[in-house]
Amino acid sequence: YPNASPLLGSSWGGLIHLYTATARNSYHLQIHKNGHVDGAPHQTIYSALMIRSEDAGFVVITGVMSRRYLCMDFRGNIFGSHYFDPENCRFQHQTLENGYDVYHSPQYHFLVSLGRAKRAFLPGMNPPPYSQFLSRRNEIPLIHFNTPIPRRHTQSAEDDSERDPLNVLKPRARMTPAPASCSQELPSAEDNSPMASDPLGVVRGGRVNTHAGGTGPEGCRPFAKFI
């Protein structure tokens, strides 16, 4: 890949943020430059991700600022790595009945989670909210992403196509806005009026379907109420 400004890459229009959402808050998964993975209450340059969909529901998740792949070790710890290991850095994506997404390691079976507990994914399970994710379009001005495009690092000296056999770093445009009918708040479990607990209107849209296929006839996702 040429060492050009990332702003010239078409994929930069497809940056997304994965976030967990409860009725009151949300945390965005971020991959720091040192490989530490945690959650932030807001979009940050380290929570801007590229998600490449592969066959059979597998995805590869890359932090664009850290230039690290989201990976998981055998204990279920998630971390960012410059090196792509297909066993550790590919995740099975599944959309739950509630429209939220879960990601788990096909190798170790643990869920990707922003909580500290490590839990294996079992079909039909209802994971805790900090293991369920939604996607939002990037809202951070691209000028803040003043870094080279992430690339796969390997010890070998093969050409770029060998270093990126899954074409992770040039993801196809697969971000589809949710239908207008989806842009509504979920009814609050506590309040009679959605505005009652959100008088400042802090819950706003921008969620997108980051993977091929919808969750229903209209591809709608839940609209979480968070601040």
């Epitope: 409860t22 009151r24 808050n25 994971p127 909210p129 802090v202």
Partner: antibody
């Protein structure tokens, strides 16, 4: 080390307002939501609301709608909780608590607010 | 909103006893439940997160179990410093607390 240090005890008249502060240190202030929880004498814990430290957006329990205002000052890593139209049943210890996604891991020492005529 | 109930509301026990406290949610909350210990005049202290995971620094005599709607906090061998009030809290929807269980000396 993480510390949440709250302002001192207050005595207020019914109908007045009180503003409690919570100064955070030992971590990146903007990376964690902050909550307010209160506890009336001899009673249990009651969640009041949450503030996003970077945007200042808040969300409150319905019970406190219109009476509680949560703010923050990022320059001093401090969050504030103001409760208005005080009544005797607002007499309680008020705590701030840091959210770490799956729990409240650090709590302030508590601020006793007494409402009495 | 999801309601949490705890039982018993209070119990008397002796040092060395095995103590079990239950917390029930009005609807399923997966494993998004935590347990706190609170002593008089002090802020709550986190014991268990995600229903069954021990917080760092908490003695191993404390354990948690359960998923969905029914949860349990167990103290395998009660120590003098364990006499306190214990609260559950759910993180699935809002942040409601249980009413508490007071453990005092028999």
């Amino acid at each position: 080390q993480v510390q949440l240090v709250q302002s001192g005890a207050e005595v207020k008249k019914p109908g007045a307002s009180v503003k409690v502060s919570c100064k955070a240190s030992g971590y990146t202030f903007t990376n964690h939501y902050m909550h307010w929880v209160r506890q009336a004498p001899g009673q249990g814990l009651e969640w009041m609301g949450i503030i996003n430290p970077i945007s200042g957006s808040t969300s409150n329990a319905q019970k406190f709608q219109g009476r509680v205002t949560m703010t923050r000052d990022t320059s001093t890593s401090t969050v504030y909780m103001e409760l208005s139209s005080l009544r005797s049943e607002d007499t309680a210890v008020y705590y701030c608590a840091r959210d770490i996604v799956d729990a409240f891991d650090f709590w302030g020492q508590g601020t006793m607010v007494t409402v009495s005529s | 909103a999801i309601q949490l109930t705890q039982s018993p509301s209070s119990l008397s026990a002796s040092v060395g006893d095995r103590v079990t406290i239950t917390c029930r949610a009005s609807q399923g909350i997966s494993s998004a439940l935590v347990w706190y210990q609170q002593k008089p005049g002090k802020a709550p202290k986190l014991l268990i997160y995600d229903a069954s995971f021990l917080e760092s620094g908490v003695p191993s005599r404390f354990s948690g179990s359960g998923s969905g709607t029914d949860f349990t906090l167990t103290i395998s061998s009660l120590q003098p410093e364990d006499f306190a009030t214990y609260y559950c809290q759910q993180f699935n929807d809002y942040f409601t607390f249980g009413p508490g269980t007071k453990v005092d000396i028999k």
